[in-house]
């Protein structure tokens, strides 16, 4: 998160970590308890490591009581997620267990209404991605507001020229932004998961190259079947 | 499929307006920027300017302000460009394009002469 | 605004030969987002321009692969390597990283 802040912990009890060999890769968000949506791309990344998916945490290094590691038992990207591409960037990891609820621990609900966030709506975005260009990564959660921006002018020639379908949303990224290590997190408005954030290679923080949401609205009926 | 079809020709006397319309399908309308450019016989290209059919906001090159009023119908998917003034120098094909994959998808072209 | 020069005005040419048109700003036409938005587009007599490149050099989706377009900066090309009868026509180079966006005066393709 380029622009944040450190999160209040253990405040955005929906935040996971997705972990290969026991290091940060990707952001994801509890929508079930045994369920984990995060982003495709962020498989390709894990090769054959061990995936793991960490519950509960502020401080990815430090012991706390809330936080739990657990295995995944399956992994579902989404069949039309391609390499080349960031259509249909989304995957459920289904936990080995169902996740152990609590204050630190909780499902958030999602965005079922295909109806576009109205633009200039502030919306939170989480994650242990980058804070600096330097790449200089966190050990505790960062959150930014970001507001909503219209998709036509993330469509521009001189945004993202016209890459951004029905399917996507798009936030502002003046300096505020998520970055790379945020990917598979949440963008959240009004309490409800409204975004997956995409795992491009976009640059972050320039306001002309504006972050890219993958609108779980839009995909209710996959997230469904998978989670039946 | 992406279209932009346009309004007929226009005949118009000097000092008059008029109002030309392109109607979009194919793709949502409040998705992309739609912009106006200027074909005058056997020349060059001129940009007009562009509008955000979300909320209206318009960018005008500063030749074409005060001639060219750029406005949209979301109800319709129609974007419209009104030309008030005219004079014999307005007399040009004016083309719609749709911004976003540079500008791959225009209308056909409407001609508007302007003659007494 | 920015000029774009294109260069020559007229090209005349023999089907199967290599075409090349030079195009120049008058100032960079980098973005302040490091990338380069300079387009070809072709227009035939009757018709709206066609897109065939964009961002310098990428073709757009269609476009056959006798068309290239390189440079950067202030310096652009579009190369078609065998020339078709469908090939033809006006080409415009475009700047689209400065408002207001330019064209090129054109450059006609046609038959020696």
């Known amino acids: 998160i380029l622009g944040g802040r450190e999160a209040e912990a253990h405040a955005r009890p929906y935040m996971a970590s997705v972990q290969v060999n026991g290091e940060h890769l990707c952001g994801g968000v509890l929508v079930a308890e045994q369920w984990v949506l995060s982003a495709a791309h962020c498989l390709e990344d894990a090769a054959d490591g061990k995936v793991q998916v960490l519950l509960g945490a502020h401080s990815l290094s430090q012991p706390e009581p809330s936080k739990r590691l657990y295995d995944v038992l399956r992994a579902v990207p989404h069949p039309d997620s391609r390499p080349d591409t960031i259509d249909h960037d989304l995957l459920l990891l289904q936990l080995s267990e169902k996740a152990t609820l609590g204050p630190a621990v909780r499902p958030l609900p999602w965005q079922r209404v295909d109806r576009d966030v109205e633009p200039g709506t502030l919306c939170d975005v989480a994650g242990w991605g980058i804070v600096s260009h330097a790449g200089r990564r966190p050990d505790r959660l960062q959150h930014v507001l970001l507001p909503v921006l219209d998709r036509a002018t993330c469509n521009r020639r001189t945004h993202h020229d016209g890459a951004i379908t029905q399917r996507m949303m798009c936030a502002e990224s003046n300096r505020r932004d998520s970055c790379k290590g945020d990917s598979g997190g949440p963008l959240v408005c009004g309490g409800v998961l409204e975004g997956v954030v995409t795992s491009g290679s976009r640059v972050c923080g320039n306001r002309k190259k504006p972050g890219i949401y993958t609108r779980v609205a839009s995909y209710a009926a996959w997230i469904d079947s998978v989670l039946a | 499929e992406v279209q932009l079809q346009q309004s007929g020709p226009e005949l118009v006397k000097p000092g008059a307006s008029v109002k030309i319309s392109c109607k979009a399908s194919?793709?949502?309308?409040?998705?992309?920027?739609m912009n106006w450019v200027k074909q005058s016989h056997g020349k060059s290209l001129e940009w007009i300017g562009d509008?955000?059919?979300?909320?209206?906001?318009?960018s005008y090159n500063q030749k074409f302000k005060g001639k060219a009023t750029l406005t949209v119908d979301k109800s319709s998917s129609t974007a419209y460009m009104e030309l008030r003034s005219l004079t014999s120098g307005d007399s040009a094909v004016y083309y719609c394009t749709r911004e976003g994959a540079s500008f791959a998808f225009w209308g056909q072209g409407t001609l508007v002469t302007v003659s007494a | 605004d920015v000029l774009m020069t294109q260069t020559p005005l007229s090209l005349p040419v023999s089907l199967g030969d290599q075409a090349s048109i030079s195009c120049r700003s008058s100032?960079?036409?980098?973005?302040?987002?490091?990338?380069?938005?300079l387009e070809w587009y072709l227009q035939k007599p009757g018709q709206s321009p066609k897109l065939l490149i964009y961002k310098v050099s990428n073709r757009f989706s269609g476009v056959p692969d006798r068309f290239s377009g390189s440079g950067s900066g202030t310096d652009f090309t579009l190369k078609i390597s065998r020339v078709e009868a469908e090939d033809l026509g006006v080409y415009y180079c475009f700047q689209g990283s400065h408002v207001p966006l330019t064209f090129g005066a054109g450059t006609k393709l046609e038959l020696k």
């Open positions: 194919g793709y949502t309308f409040t998705d992309h920027y």
């Open positions: 509008i955000n059919p979300n909320n209206g906001g318009t």
């Open positions: 100032q960079s036409i980098v973005h302040s987002n490091g990338d380069t938005y």
